[in-house]
């Protein structure tokens, strides 16, 4: 018996087609992805093949103005239109709190939404009961397939799930649910979830009875043969893991942003054992037509976005200096504003020992593309912020050793004075440079804000200590020459859309007046 699994993950509100790098589509003849194009390909495959499941491994939420405006209603609407069969909860599904998940998505989705390792407690337990499930048994042709969901146990540090959801260890939580499916005589089981490729592989290895793992979170691109675009494969598709009980378990993921549609064909024997698996992600490039009816619906929903981008988010009573003459040479108040917003967006009161789990922010000055003049009645709009942060990036959470951070700050000024983009703006960091010293030895003082303290204060950076830092995904990926971050980071979790982080902060503060306050000094 053959099953076709079509899968997406980490779509991050790319409902419209995008450029090849998943930013805003500029030249339509070169654009990719989007739900209208995805629908065309899904329909084609459904027409051709008998037993097809369309699955999403989480993080539909967060990433473009679509999410900012529609807050998840767009996800439910278009996933319903595409007739998804199931979705796993990702960490970003909690970005607007549990209510922001329940109302727009859980209550509106016409497909099951899954996670076996999220347990509700207290008053939330009855409110959310039945709105998401640990697993779902789906009829597919003449057979049944069990889908069991999982979500990153790090979600409380990455999003806003509140205090009434407990995120258990994935493997511990999955095993009893898979066992339950086995007692229900379900012999074909897919683990669908959002914990990253390393955890996906562990699930394949450790959870008895899981036949296939469909993952997300790490934006992993797997491919067999010559890859069709810029993404470099992390391994073959499917990636085969030998389980502890000797089975060959295919593990798949389909990069991110709706650029690819994962296509996996599995052949099962009559006892539900995987006999063979093959496939590849399908690049959704512009040679695949956008479905006219879905496209028309997208255009209808778009109207509200255009209106939103000119509405006032808040006011500034000071000039927001985002000029390259400032932000690439010295501390600039636009950099301070953005870093403060980045930290504010990551406030998670973890326990009594820590006032927060992260206190530090770094931001390449070259990523700040425009100032905002306060003399326009102080008004700040999404449109204004899009000029400051035009690249559609994310502000991510990483873990780095102190020694890596020191290298990053040396890189920040290694060729100072040439108006290059690597000059770092900061938050929760005090740095002093001596430019008379040779490149690679210019950081004379580097103090960082404590997190394990009731009254935050600045302490010298410790080389061997591991620190959490919020930074643009551009830097996490080694951009602007920050190869040491890419090479030495110990953990990387993708965060929220950059403009959304700053716009939310400004809306929350209502009136802003960021200053230049001595975060960056020259001796």
């Amino acid at each position: 018996w053959e099953l076709t699994i079509l899968h997406t993950n980490d779509v991050h509100s790319r409902l419209e087609q995008t450029s090849e790098d998943s930013s805003k589509c500029v030249n339509a003849s070169r654009c990719m992805g989007g739900v209208a194009r995805l629908f065309t390909k899904v329909q084609q495959i459904r027409r051709a093949e008998p037993n097809v499941l369309l699955l999403d491994a989480g993080d539909q939420y967060q990433g473009t103005i679509w999410f900012t405006v529609y807050k998840g209603a767009e996800v439910a609407h278009f996933m319903n239109a595409l007739r998804y069969d199931a979705m796993a909860l990702g960490n970003h599904e909690f970005d607007n709190g549990v209510e922001g998940l329940i109302e727009p998505l859980l209550k509106e989705a016409k497909f099951p939404i899954l996670s076996a390792n999220i347990k509700a407690k207290g008053p939330l337990a009855s409110q959310i009961s039945g709105l998401y499930l640990p697993y779902k048994v789906l009829p597919v042709g003449d057979e049944v397939v069990g889908i069991v969901g999982y979500t990153s146990k790090e979600t409380p540090f990455l999003s806003n799930p509140g205090t009434n959801l407990v995120f258990e260890d994935e493997i511990t939580a999955l095993q009893p649910e898979v066992d339950k499916l086995k007692t229900l005589n379900v012999n074909k089981i897919i683990a669908l979830g959002h914990s990253g490729f390393e955890t996906d592989k562990l699930i394949a290895q450790k959870v008895r009875g899981v036949d296939v793992v469909v993952g997300g979170h790490s934006n992993t691109f797997l491919y067999t043969g010559n890859p069709p675009s810029k993404e470099v494969p992390a391994g073959k598709y499917p990636f085969i893991v030998t389980s502890d009980d000797g089975r060959k378990v295919p593990v798949v993921q389909a990069y991110a942003f709706g650029k690819y549609l994962g296509y996996l064909k599995i052949e099962f024997d009559e006892r539900g054992n995987v006999i063979s698996s093959h496939g590849n992600p399908i690049l959704l490039n512009s040679s695949i037509p956008e479905d006219p009816s879905i496209k028309a619906d997208i255009n209808k929903w778009r109207i509200k976005l255009d209106n939103y981008s000119t509405q006032e988010l808040g006011k500034t009573i000071v000039y927001l200096d985002g000029s390259s003459q400032s932000c690439r040479f010295r501390e600039c108040n636009m950099g301070n504003l953005i870093c403060d917003a980045m930290i504010n967006n990551n406030l998670r009161h973890a326990d009594e020992m820590f006032w927060n789990h992260v206190s530090m922010c770094i931001l390449n000055g070259g990523g700040i593309r425009s100032p905002i003049d306060e003399r326009n009645n102080g008004t700040i709009t999404w449109e204004n912020l899009a000029a400051v942060l035009p690249f559609g990036g994310t502000f991510d959470l990483v873990q780095l050793k102190g020694s890596t951070l020191k290298k990053a700050f040396e890189h920040s000024v290694h060729r100072y004075g040439q108006s290059t983009g690597e000059f770092l703006q900061v938050g929760g960091i005090h740095v002093v440079y001596d430019l008379s010293r040779k490149p690679g030895d210019r950081v004379v003082k580097l103090d960082v804000l404590c997190t394990k303290c009731r009254v935050p204060s600045y302490d010298p950076l410790k080389m061997d200590e591991i620190y959490k830092v919020i930074l643009p995904n551009f830097l996490a990926n080694g951009g602007d020459g920050f190869q040491m971050i890419k090479d030495e980071l110990l953990r990387h979790d993708s965060g929220d859309q950059d403009i959304n982080v700053v716009s939310t902060y400004i809306s929350k503060m209502k009136v802003i007046y960021p200053a230049v306050e001595g975060r960056i000094k020259f001796s």
């Epitope: 040679s287 037509p289 956008e290």
Partner: antibody, heavy 121, light 107 residues
Framework: EVQLVQSGAEVKKPGESLKISCKGS????????LSWVRQMPGKGLEWMGE????????YYNEKFKGQVTISADKSISTAYLQWSSLKASDTAMYYC??????????????WGAGTTVTVSS | DIVMTQSPDSLAVSLGERATINCKAS??????VAWYQQKPGQPPKLLIY???YRYSGVPDRFSGSGSGTDFTLTISSLQAEDVAVYYC?????????FGGGTKLEIK
């Protein structure tokens, strides 16, 4: 090398049955769709229907539904077009054509050389 | 059914000159249009798929454009071997329908 090899020309009488074939080679037969296209003498092209050999799913142009049957035998990588009762108006060239539904070439990328069917009393 | 109206029915163009063939769909077919060349006694050959993508091995003098309902096949510099009948086809909805064909000759 991808090839679609069609069976030879046929001369039939009205009311007779006929089954013509199209054998695919040089590719995974079950991973593509196969269509049948009719071209009447001196006329244009008409899509009759298609089969996806992997699933056996068939789709017909309403105009040809009930007039012809499309089938496939994946064990020998061959698709068929058959009539139970031919008419003089079935006289035409019949092409099979391949469709890559997993790829992005929206069109028929390989065609057979065609089978001429002549129906005459 | 979606009707594909091709124009002109026939076209005579001098060698080295540009030839343009148009195709109009009776409803929006996005970019799901292919163009074929058929020479006497031969099966059709795919030239352009998805409205504007040249199929592998097709000379770059052939190009396609359009989306929605209006599509064009252009031969930038006509060669003697381009004499043939050209068909457009929509691949958006079944039944997949072809245009009536354009017979291209040398002037």
């Amino acid at each position: 090398e991808v090839q679609l090899v069609q069976s030879g020309a046929e001369v039939k009488k009205p009311g007779e049955s006929l089954k013509i074939s199209c054998k695919g080679s040089g590719y995974t037969f079950t991973s593509y769709g196969l269509s049948w296209v009719r071209q009447m003498p001196g006329k244009g092209l008409e899509w009759m229907g298609e089969i996806y050999p992997g699933s056996g799913n068939t789709y017909y142009n309403e105009k040809f539904k009930g007039q012809v049957t499309i089938s496939a035998d994946k064990s020998i990588s061959t698709a068929y077009l058959q009539w139970s009762s031919l008419k003089a108006s079935d006289t035409a060239m019949y092409y099979c054509a391949r469709y890559d539904y997993l790829g992005s070439s929206y069109g028929f990328d390989y065609w057979g050389a065609g089978t001429t069917v002549t129906v005459s009393s | 059914d979606i009707v594909m109206t091709q124009s002109p029915d026939s076209l005579a163009v001098s060698l080295g000159e540009r030839a343009t063939i148009n195709c109009k769909a009776s409803q929006d077919v996005s970019t799901a249009v292919a163009w074929y060349q058929q020479k006497p006694g031969q099966p059709p050959k795919l030239l352009i798929y998805s409205a504007s993508y040249r199929y592998s091995g097709v000379p770059d003098r052939f190009s396609g454009s359009g989306s929605g309902t209006d599509f064009t096949l252009t031969i930038s510099s006509l060669q003697a071997e381009d004499v043939a009948v050209y068909y457009c086809q929509q691949h958006y909805n079944t039944p997949y329908t072809f245009g009536g064909g354009t017979k291209l000759e040398i002037k």
